[in-house]
């Protein structure tokens, strides 16, 4: 089929970076400025992506490949191919409908993006809190309270059953 196609379809000979120009007797014409074709045999060239506003150019468009964008400082990429730019917040905050807001008590965010997550509930693993959590950092769990009491055996007691809706400590 491919051999038949190439014999019958002169467009299949047009390489990437060109298009098969129906207006010029199916001659392979170079892609016009600000357009590209990444595969051979194309009947049109695609318009290059433009990186505008908070989007900045990471890779220029060429006749054979599209431009690639990333985000200006203070923003980070979301979505495939950096289809969106989202404003950074500070650590200890999350982006809400009303802007960057501090994490509620009992939650933390150690990045400039994403949402505040609940502190680890140490007691669910039968452990105690070694270092308290903050808006920016999760709690650090230590040995179980039994391990810390004098004369306690080295056998860790089984973790208590998880209670539904147990609040983070």
């Amino acid at each position: 089929f491919e051999r038949t196609r190439s014999l019958q379809d002169p467009c299949s000979n047009c390489p990437a970076g060109t298009f098969c120009d129906n207006n010029r007797n199916q001659i392979c014409s170079p892609c016009p400025p600000n357009s590209f074709s990444s595969a051979g045999g194309q009947r049109t060239c695609d318009i290059c992506r433009q990186c505008k506003g908070v989007f900045r150019t990471r890779k220029e468009c060429s006749s054979t490949s599209n431009a690639e964008c990333d985000c200006t400082p203070g923003f980070h990429c979301l979505g495939a191919g950096c289809s969106m730019c989202e404003q950074d917040c500070k650590q200890g905050q999350e982006l809400t409908k009303k802007g960057c807001k501090d994490c509620c008590f009992g939650t933390f965010n150690d990045q400039k993006r994403g949402i505040c997550r609940p502190w680890t509930n140490c007691s669910l693993d039968g452990k105690s809190v070694l270092v308290n959590g903050t808006k920016e950092r999760d709690v650090v769990c230590g040995p179980s309270p039994a391990d810390l009491s004098p004369g306690a055996s080295s056998v860790t007691p089984p973790a208590p059953a998880r209670e539904p809706g147990h609040s983070p400590q």
Epitope: R49, K52, G53, V54, F55, C69, F75, L78, C82, S83, M84, C85, E86, Q87, L95, T96, K97, K98, G99, C100
Partner: nanobody, 122 residues
């Protein structure tokens, strides 16, 4: 072709006011959410304010109670009324479509104006 043209920038003293306008064409303005962003000298972009097609408004914390975004669908124009201006408001202000409807988020399909300079100085 989509066009966004900002105007109204200039030099103003601290405590003064300016009203920026953004004239839109080439798309259905009345059903589009719009936004304002700014870029201070040597700094990154900052999301300033947004307005939904229905009129709901959103502001970044630093301009709340000082800036007011509004729109006139009959004139295809969005405005940013800036009161009690401070030196830290000095920036190039950009008008942009706001297809994501999410605070602080723009998409690749959004369109941007060329910007208008606002300088707050005594």
């Amino acid at each position: 072709e989509v066009q966004l043209v900002e105007s109204g920038g200039g030099l103003v003293q601290p405590g003064g006011s300016l009203r920026l306008s953004c004239a839109a064409s080439g798309f259905t303005f009345s059903s589009s959410a719009m936004s304002w962003a700014r870029q201070a000298p040597g700094k990154g972009f900052e999301w300033v304010s947004g307005i939904y097609s229905g009129g709901s408004t959103y502001y970044t914390e630093s301009v709340k109670d000082r800036f007011t975004i509004s729109r006139d669908n009959s004139k295809n124009t969005v405005y940013l009324q800036m009161n009690s201006l401070k030196p830290e408001d000095t920036a190039v202000y950009y008008c942009a479509t706001w297809g994501t409807l999410r605070f602080g988020v723009w998409a690749e399909y959004d369109h941007w104006g060329q910007g208008t300079q606002v300088t707050v100085s005594s």
